[in-house]
């Protein structure tokens, strides 16, 4: 079974800068999985943001601006990255990655 680790306990960024979060997949080939990213804002329910599937297809939550989040997959390091562009106060949240095995 696959295992996920998010090595960054926290990330602090200046407003309008870019944040990059990592999710390391082990126990399974990342190219054979779909990785999902979610966020949980303080006091709010968890929300799906974006996913990347085994074939590279990217899906995002409806209503999220197209340039806000970027998801990628690096097979060499078995890592999925979530890039958050133009960081603003409403991006303060806990971000989770999840795995779906094909």
């Amino acid at each position: 079974a696959g295992h996920l680790e998010q090595p960054q306990i926290s990330s602090t960024k200046t407003l309008s800068k870019t944040a990059r979060l990592e999710c390391v997949v082990s126990g399974i080939t990342i190219s054979a999985t779909s990785v999902y990213w979610y966020r949980e804002r303080p006091g709010e329910v968890i929300q799906f943001l974006v996913s990347i599937s085994y074939d590279g297809t990217v899906r995002k939550e409806s209503g999220i601006p197209s340039g806000k989040f970027e998801v990628d997959r690096i097979p060499e390091t078995s890592t999925s990255t979530l890039t958050i562009h133009n960081v603003e106060k409403q991006d303060i949240a806990t971000y989770y990655c999840a795995l779906w095995e094909v």
Partner: nanobody, 125 residues
Framework: EVQLVESGGGLVQAGGSLRLSCAAT????????MGWFRQAPGKEREFAAA????????YYADSVKGRFTISRDNAKNTVYLQMNSLKPEDTAVYYC??????????????????WGQGTQVTVSS
């Protein structure tokens, strides 16, 4: 509402090239990932190529990889499909499509919000 209008199709000899364009009007173009599909006579519509919202990622069907190039100009609200080394089996009606929430080869046709009317490409041997 987004309107998509394809152009650039035509008749070309095998080995030749064509450049298809898809002009979008309506809502903000950069809000949409774009795809090109094709439908040959008597066959189902199939994925050919796609490009992400920003243009940083491109995707291709195996049958066109290395011959076709998809690109977009968000300032001109246009997506392009450069088709080189054309083969008779590339003969089809080519459609462009726009998706607000999905980008890539695995996007289902119903995940595309808008479609163009298509442009005919005929490759003669």
């Amino acid at each position: 509402e987004v309107q998509l209008v394809e152009s650039g199709g035509g008749l070309v000899q095998a080995g030749g090239s064509l450049r298809l364009s898809c002009a979008a009007t309506g809502r903000t173009f950069s809000e949409y990932a774009m795809g090109w599909f094709r439908q040959a006579p008597g066959k189902e519509r199939e994925f050919a190529a796609a490009i992400s919202w920003t243009g940083s990622k491109t995707y291709y069907a195996d049958s066109v990889k290395g011959r076709f190039t998809i690109s977009r100009d968000n300032a001109k609200n246009t997506v392009y499909l450069q088709m080189n080394s054309l083969k008779p089996e590339d003969t089809a009606v080519y459609y462009c499509a726009a998706s607000s929430d999905c980008s890539g080869p695995g996007c289902h046709t119903e995940e595309y919000d808008y479609w163009g009317q298509g442009t005919q490409v005929t490759v003669s041997s």
